[in-house]
Interface confidence: medium
């Protein structure tokens, strides 16, 4: 009882909901459920039914194997999906898949926030640009991944002249798909003329 | 030259609090991350915790997350830490350290000794 | 977290005498991000060198080091009076930034 798998998914792609394990020989009845309650799909006596609900149209079931087929997923589809089987001997067994849908982050822009001189070494404040997201974020000196430490959403380092880079690189990422913005400077501390 | 001196080590009871200090002088503190490290007595060196130049971002070590507090007042050039529920491990001499662009600590102060003991 | 161990524990040397000191990771250090301080009894530590092979300003020459990947080294060409002391490697590759144990150069 209470099996629970996660899956994470890109909005807009087509997802199969399935389990690990073999389906209980010879079941009665196998019925997939959204949030626990609404019914998407239910299978009894070799036909499968298929409910009112937004998924109508975009799954399908496969008796067989108990996996759920949905296609053009959206965000509005994050949920817990359950399938419950009931056994012959009248037994009930459910699994139950957390779905996360994410839409791919979009191309950061990289805003200098300050640029200075600073005891002839250069301070820098950069600050990577995206709508309402939930990301991590990776900055790069050149190719050099700057260390965990400085992985937030601005970049705030002062660089020694052994330490300049030309280009900053803010990479946005979530689970399903990452970004990258760039700025390039003139050494040592001046913004490079595009 | 850049200098940085530490104070507000002593002695306190297990469970006590203190705050160290650190005064910084010759460059542009405001502009730099800077960091704590400890030693114990006739011990290595630990990295203990880290702000960032505004003051924005503060990371610390599993062994102390929780009971120290890192934070800054650049308008006094002066670096804190604030440590609660202190245990006898935690007796050290506290160094604090310029952090060279989030790499290496250069320079560090000259410490201060905390001791921990009932 | 990386873990940097320093060999040997202690070497009992003359002063014009060459030493090599040891620290390896327990996994590879990127790009050579490794520091080594020098700390004399009651001091604090001093940056001598910075990746792996870079010497800090003010370092005599007699300094060096070398070695990438989990294996460094610092040699002193040849040992002054004042280099006896404590030896600390440390690797800022990644986070938590993390040091050696140490090496303790003594006078025979």
């Known amino acids: 009882q209470g099996h629970l798998v996660h899956m994470t998914v890109v909005s807009g792609s087509n997802v199969t909901l399935n389990i690990s394990e073999s389906l209980p020989e010879n079941y009665k009845q196998l019925t997939w459920f959204y949030t626990f309650d609404q019914k998407i799909v239910e299978w009894d006596s070799r036909k499968s039914k298929y409910f009112e609900s937004k998924f109508k149209g975009r799954v399908r079931l496969d008796p067989q194997s108990g996996a759920l087929y949905i296609s053009k997923v959206q965000k509005e589809d994050n949920s817990t999906y359950i399938m419950r089987v009931l056994k012959k001997t009248g037994n009930e067994q459910e699994w139950k898949i957390k779905l996360q849908v994410l839409d791919p982050v979009p191309k950061p822009v990289i805003k200098i926030e300050k640029i200075e001189d600073m005891d002839d070494n250069c301070y820098l404040k950069l600050s990577c640009v995206i709508p309402g997201e939930s990301v991590n974020y990776t900055w790069y000196g050149d190719k050099r991944p700057f260390p965990k430490e400085l992985q937030n959403s601005v970049l705030e380092t002062t660089l020694m002249p052994h330490n300049y880079s030309r280009c900053y690189t803010c990479q946005v990422s979530n689970s399903v798909s990452s970004k990258n913005g760039t700025v390039c400077l003139s050494p040592p501390c001046t913004l490079a003329r595009s | 030259e850049v200098q940085l001196v530490e104070s507000g080590g002593g002695l306190v009871h297990p469970g006590g609090s203190l705050r160290l200090s650190c005064a910084a002088s010759?460059?542009?503190?405001?502009?730099?991350?800077m960091s704590w490290v400890r030693q114990a007595p006739g011990k290595g060196l630990e990295w203990v915790s880290l702000i960032s130049g505004s003051g924005g971002s503060t990371y610390y070590a599993d062994s102390v997350k929780g009971r120290f507090t890192i934070f800054r007042d650049n308008s006094k050039n002066t670096l804190y830490l604030q440590m609660i529920s202190l245990r006898a491990e935690d007796s050290a001499v506290y160094y604090c350290?310029?952090?060279?662009?989030?790499?290496?600590?250069?320079?560090w102060g000259q410490g201060t000794l905390v001791t921990v003991s009932s | 977290e990386i873990v940097l161990t320093q060999s040997p524990g202690t070497l009992s040397l003359s002063p014009g005498e060459r030493v090599t000191l040891s620290c390896r990771a327990s996994?590879?250090?990127?790009?050579?991000?490794l520091a080594w301080y020098q700390q004399k009894p009651g001091q604090a530590p001093r940056l001598l060198i910075y990746g792996a092979s870079s010497r800090a300003t003010g370092i005599p020459d007699r300094f060096s080091g070398s070695g990438s990947g989990t294996d460094f080294t610092l040699t002193i060409s040849r040992l002054e009076p004042e280099d006896f002391a404590m030896y600390y490697c440390q690797q800022y590759g990644s986070s938590p930034r993390t040091f050696g144990q140490g090496t303790k150069v003594e006078i025979k």
């Open positions: 350290a310029k952090y060279s662009n989030y790499d290496y600590f250069d320079p």
């Open positions: 996994q590879s250090v990127s790009s050579s991000y």
């Open positions: 010759g460059f542009t503190f405001g502009g730099y991350a």
